[in-house]
């Protein structure tokens, strides 16, 4: 008789999760000389220790502290790019602009990007069938708590001018419930961060509206200003041209507004 197993509303752990985490760690530490000292087996042990045998609705930031210790990494604090609901373009940008970093360009972000994981209370099993959904089941699940923890630390590390890429095609360009809106915005340190500069990415080719005037952007400006951080906003009307101009800034067409 098969043992009863909790059915959650979200997808189960990504197949070959342990192997994927270990392989990504090895790859990352090979590419980034400053992280060569990292012992990837210990990284996996720490990752595993954070959620294995724990109820997947009762995970805390404390559970991830050993992993956070092992993944401690110094990125230039004035070269941080945050993003919300526009991950692919943000990653394309930092692949070209190599001196800027998204969270997923750090070891811990790279390890977990696009993966799902959870365990079961009091067993050593990884649950490949289902994991808790943030809305339908619980917010203190292994994946959500991980991203909350690393996002908080990433925002806390930022300084000078911090950039954020926002999706202008969404009904809420700035969403208070996103990781950016609920975690990162509130963990920028006013004593270190001078300005938050939002880049609003337009979707339609003929969209010439000033999305920096959007009510949700005004809401973001208000939140940031109350935290004694300056706010600025730019429209990126042509994301394709924007990326092209990052690659080839000398191109004559790159002097006009993009």
């Amino acid at each position: 008789v098969p043992r009863w197993r909790q059915q959650w509303s979200g997808p189960g752990t990504t197949k070959r999760f342990p192997e994927t985490v270990l392989a990504r760690c090895v790859k990352y530490t090979e590419i980034h000389p400053e992280m060569r000292h990292v012992d990837c087996q210990s990284v996996w042990d720490a990752f595993k220790g954070a959620f294995i045998s724990k109820h997947p609705c009762n995970i805390t930031e404390e559970d991830y502290q050993p992993l956070m210790k092992l993944g401690t990494q110094t990125v230039p604090c004035n070269k941080i790019l945050l993003w919300s609901r526009i991950k692919d373009l943000a990653h394309q940008f930092t692949q070209v602009q190599r001196d800027m970093f998204t969270l997923e360009d750090t070891l811990l972000g790279y390890l977990a990007d696009d993966l799902t994981w959870c365990g079961e209370f009091n067993t050593s099993k990884i649950n490949y069938q289902s994991c808790p959904d943030w809305r339908k089941d619980c917010s203190n699940n292994p994946v959500s708590v991980f991203w909350k923890t690393v996002s908080r630390r990433f925002a806390e590390a930022a300084c000078d001018v911090v950039h954020v890429m926002l999706n202008g095609s969404r009904s809420k360009i700035f969403d208070k419930n996103s990781t950016f809106g609920s975690v990162e915005v509130h963990n920028l340190q006013p004593e270190k961060v001078q300005t938050l500069e939002a880049w609003v990415i337009h979707g339609g080719r003929e969209d010439s509206r000033d999305l920096c005037q959007d009510p949700t952007i005004k809401e973001l400006e208000s939140i940031i200003s109350k935290r004694n951080i300056q706010f600025s906003c730019k429209n990126i009307y042509r994301p394709d041209k924007f990326l092209q101009c990052v690659k080839n800034p000398e191109d004559s067409s790159c002097t006009s507004e993009i």
Partner: antibody, heavy 116, light 107 residues
Framework: QVPLHQSGPELIKPGASLKISCKAS????????MNWVRQRPGKGLEWIGW????????KYNGKFMGKATLTADKSSGTAYMQLSSLTSEDSAVYFC?????????WGQGTSVTVSS | DIVMTQFHNFMSTSVGDRVNINCKAS??????VAWYQQKPGQSPKLLIY???TRHTGVPDRFTGSGSGTDFTLTISNVQSEDLADYFC?????????FGSGTKLEIK
Amino acid sequence: QVPLHQSGPELIKPGASLKISCKASDSAFNNSWMNWVRQRPGKGLEWIGWIYPGDDDTKYNGKFMGKATLTADKSSGTAYMQLSSLTSEDSAVYFCARGRWGMDYWGQGTSVTVSS
Amino acid sequence: DIVMTQFHNFMSTSVGDRVNINCKASQNVVTAVAWYQQKPGQSPKLLIYWASTRHTGVPDRFTGSGSGTDFTLTISNVQSEDLADYFCQQYSNYPFTFGSGTKLEIK
């Protein structure tokens, strides 16, 4: 193999304090949990606590609070354990050992004899 | 504190035999258990962690099994160099605790 080299044997008087060192020979020192373990003659192993040199975080076995103090020097890759108010009960071999999910590398041990 | 009980202080075996060394935790530690070998006059050596993962360089005749509260270290095809004390340890809860040890004697 990651050798951990501990300071030599100590003969110490009751009531005195003592500092034992444990030097790591690899660059992973800052990113390892450094444990200290006691083994009294003919007895088992007792975990004293650990230090994580990367951020100087420590965790102690309540039994050794006030008795042992763990510190680390990142620049030299050395962990230290200070033992205070020593009594004959503290006579033992003290090991440093690296690791958090099982202690994968151990020092050779430091023998401490407390006697007047 | 979690108590790790090794019921046999001594076990006697012959070269080539298979021996099981047992360890019982006073509460569920899932698989957060390590096994160590300590030869006379030496430091302990890690054999097994996560209850069943063999540490680098450990011969495959050493096998760990169990979960929850009951754990076993199995040595198959015992060799004369296996004469040692064997300790289990839990790292599920603080403080970490060790079993009292099982001395393996070779007949």
